[in-house]
């Protein structure tokens, strides 16, 4: 057992049939001695006298909140949760698996550019009593500060008959050089919990690896005289990192129509402008990448052709 | 500006060009490394992340962007001086920062040139033949160098008597790249900024 | 399978005009570019032209324009490359090649030698 | 005009060895650059895609890098089949140009 956070505590099981358990003392938080007695959640029904209360944990109808009083008055709680470990595994049941970029990824991150500010975001099917809290530090063994805000309801969408919910949460490197050379990761903890369980979450990653920048901005077109070719041209994203000369991107340019099976003209460069042939109810199309570190491009910003 | 290829600007283009080249070069080596080697830990991942360079030279501070220099956190340790010779220098103009920052590059290059050449040496005797260093990749460390012209005293090719550990060389070569590789994005960010400045 | 069928070899006259065909199949023949490109007896690729079948653009590499017109007829799922002026230093093997993508070419047909002898 | 140079124009490979053909742009085109093989009597085949993408149905031991003005195709080991006549190709812009042509031969 160990403490989450003030009375809340965590108490880890083998979860297997006929499991033995775990034995739990709870302690009531007072000076009294005498005359108290615990009982569990809403229920009035005492489960034992004394400053201290051992119990069996088996299941989830053994934890909840524990309170201890005193001639009708509330002395202190004891909020106790679950964590749930399955064949040596620690359960994963309160986020989706997102399997990108592989298999059991819950957590995603992504940051715009390299100031240290970045976005992790995850997915639940789940909608009520459901808390989630954030730690994030640069490097493990003597960890440098890393400061998260709370993590909110970000999106919601229907899958079928599901509906999924997306939370995100933004973190910022307390003390980040744009230029430094990463040799320790960023770790993430993401604490969840539904109900009386808990889970713990972990995403461990260089800044460089999650970089995706926005799309570029200012897409405008020119037609060529006495020709089919349009000179496209564009600007850097205002969120990408400065000067742009040292943060350089590189360039996909495309004109497509509605559908991907569509034919189209692809053409990568590094300048902020290009000259593609444009075509009736097509769209010209651009994304971006870091030009020196092959992280993930940008979505498309796009402009019809006519 | 783009430069064309055939009319080199005399300045930092040759540099650009090669650091190019070098980023090239060490992706591919690092990306055979990892097919190669895939039952070895040799991803991002797994492996440390050690760099050779540290406390030896200052890559990153001395050639950090003006715009940068106002980041404190870009600030920890500019102290280290070189050598302020070079090819690569666009005019007499050029600053000391100039100066240090591809001296920096240039003693990178050649600490990594010799653990790289040394490290071949113990591929070489390996009796399974698995993965040498690409001679491209050696090839255009080389040019580079000679690109940024420093004098420097030459670093002695580190042998060792003892029998080769085949596994933990090939580890420390995904430890080497890795860095390198990450040493070669700076490079070649340094050296578009130089171009464009 | 997709595959381009060109029209057979042809011997022509200097001053003279030359038509080659390409028959596609498989896959919609207006969704793909369509390409000509040629090649001189042990010589490199040499790329004339492009048309899109689906609206009739087309491009022509500077060299050849005015003297070359590239034509698709989307009924029959061909494409024509027709080649005025000719003079001995057109002699050449003739590709028809195609691709979703504009710039490079993904199926190649098996070529048309044109040779130009007076 | 964009001006594509290979080296070398001939290239005698011991079959099981590697080769790595060069590719040089006269100005920089990214990587617009793609690569045919064409054996004789024969029209050309698509081997890479934008530098570097693999095509499917192309062996694995057929690889690309390059970016900017400087390219390689590289062949792993090189097998009966693959001597042939290799070109590249820029698409950065009209005109579409090819490289002269490098031929593997049997060393």
């Known amino acids: 057992i160990w403490e989450l956070k003030k009375d809340v505590y965590v108490v880890e099981l083998d979860w297997y049939p006929d499991a033995p358990g775990e034995m739990v003392v709870l302690t009531c938080d007072t000076p009294e001695e005498d005359g108290i007695t615990w009982t569990l959640d809403q229920s009035s029904e005492v489960l034992g006298s004394g400053k201290t209360l051992t119990i069996q944990v088996k299941e989830f109808g053994d934890a909840g909140q524990y309170t201890c009083h005193k001639g009708g008055e509330v002395l202190s709680h004891s909020l106790l949760l679950l964590h749930k470990k399955e064949d040596g595994i620690w359960s994963t049941d309160i986020l989706k698996d997102q399997k990108e970029p592989k298999n059991k990824t819950f957590l995603r991150c992504e940051a715009k550019n390299y100031s240290g500010r970045f976005t992790c975001w995850w997915l639940t099917t789940i909608s009520t009593d459901l808390t989630f809290s954030v730690k994030s530090s640069r490097g493990s063994s003597d960890p440098q500060g890393v400061t998260c805000g709370a993590a909110t309801l970000s999106a919601e969408r229907v899958r079928g008959d599901n509906k999924e919910y997306e939370y995100s949460v933004e973190c910022q490197e307390d003390s980040a050089c744009p230029a430094a050379e990463e040799s320790l990761p960023i770790e993430v903890m993401v604490d969840a919990v539904h109900k009386l369980k808990y889970e713990n979450y972990t995403s461990s990653f260089f800044i460089r690896d999650i970089i995706k920048p926005d799309p570029p901005k200012n897409l405008q077109l020119k037609p060529l005289k006495n020709s089919r070719q349009v000179e496209v041209s564009w600007e850097y994203p205002d969120t990408w990192s400065t000067p742009h000369s040292y943060f350089s991107l590189t360039f996909c340019v495309q004109v497509q129509g509605k559908s991907k099976r569509e034919k189209k003209d692809r053409v990568f460069t590094d300048k902020t402008s290009a000259t593609v042939i444009c075509r009736k109810n097509a769209s010209i199309s651009v994304r971006a990448q870091d030009r020196y570190y092959s992280s993930s491009w940008s979505e498309w910003a796009s402009v019809p052709c006519s | 500006r783009n430069l064309p290829v055939a009319t080199p600007d005399p300045g930092m283009f040759p540099c650009l060009h090669h650091s190019q080249n070098l980023l090239r070069a060490v992706s591919n080596m690092l990306q055979k490394a990892r097919q190669t080697l895939e039952f070895y830990p040799c991803t991002s991942e797994e492996i440390d992340h050690e760099d050779i360079t540290k406390d030896k030279t200052s890559t990153v501070e001395a050639c950090l962007p003006l715009e940068l220099t106002k980041n404190e956190s870009c600030l920890n340790s500019r102290e280290t001086s070189f050598i302020t010779n070079g090819s690569c220098l666009a005019s007499r103009k050029t600053s000391f920062m100039m100066a240090l920052c591809l001296s920096s590059i240039y003693e990178d290059l050649k600490m990594y040139q010799v653990e790289f050449k040394t490290m071949n040496a113990k591929l070489l005797m390996d009796p399974k033949r698995q993965i040498f260093l690409d001679q491209n990749m050696l090839a255009v460390i080389d040019e580079l160098m000679q690109a940024l012209n420093f004098n420097s005293e030459t670093v002695p090719q580190k042998s060792s008597l003892e029998e080769p550990d085949f596994y933990k060389t090939k580890i420390k070569l995904c430890i080497l790249l890795h860095a390198f590789r990450i040493r070669a994005v700076t490079i070649d960010r340094v050296m578009s900024y130089l171009n464009a400045s | 399978q997709v595959q381009l069928v060109q029209s057979g070899a042809e011997v022509k006259k200097p001053g003279s005009s030359v038509k080659v065909s390409c028959k596609a199949s498989?896959?919609?023949?207006?969704?793909?570019?369509l390409h000509w490109v040629r090649q001189a007896p042990g010589q490199g690729l040499e790329w004339m032209g492009w048309i899109d079948p689906e609206n009739g653009d087309t491009e022509y590499a500077p060299k050849f324009q005015g003297r070359v017109t590239i034509t698709a007829d989307e009924s029959t799922s061909t494409a024509y490359m027709e080649l005025s002026s000719l003079r001995s230093e057109d002699t050449a093997v003739y590709y028809c090649?195609?691709?979703?993508?504009?710039?490079?070419?993904?199926?190649i047909g098996q070529g048309t030698l044109v040779t130009v002898s007076s | 005009d964009i001006v594509m140079t290979q080296s070398p124009l001939s290239l005698p490979v011991t079959p099981g060895e590697p080769a790595s053909i060069s590719c040089r742009a006269s100005?920089?085109?990214?990587?617009?650059l793609h690569w045919y093989q064409q054996k004789p009597g024969q029209a050309p085949r698509q081997l890479i895609a934008f530098a570097s993408q693999s095509i499917s149905g192309v062996p694995s031991r057929f690889s690309g890098s390059g970016s900017g003005t400087d390219f390689t195709l590289t062949i792993s080991s090189l097998q009966p089949e693959d001597f042939a006549t290799y070109y590249c190709?820029?698409?950065?812009?009209?005109?579409?140009?090819f490289g002269q042509g490098t031929k593997v031969e049997i060393k």
């Open positions: 190709q820029q698409s950065n812009s009209f005109p579409l140009t």
């Open positions: 090649a195609r691709n979703k993508e504009l710039r490079y070419f993904d199926v």
């Open positions: 498989g896959g919609t023949f207006s969704d793909y570019y």
């Open positions: 100005q920089s085109i990214s990587i617009n």
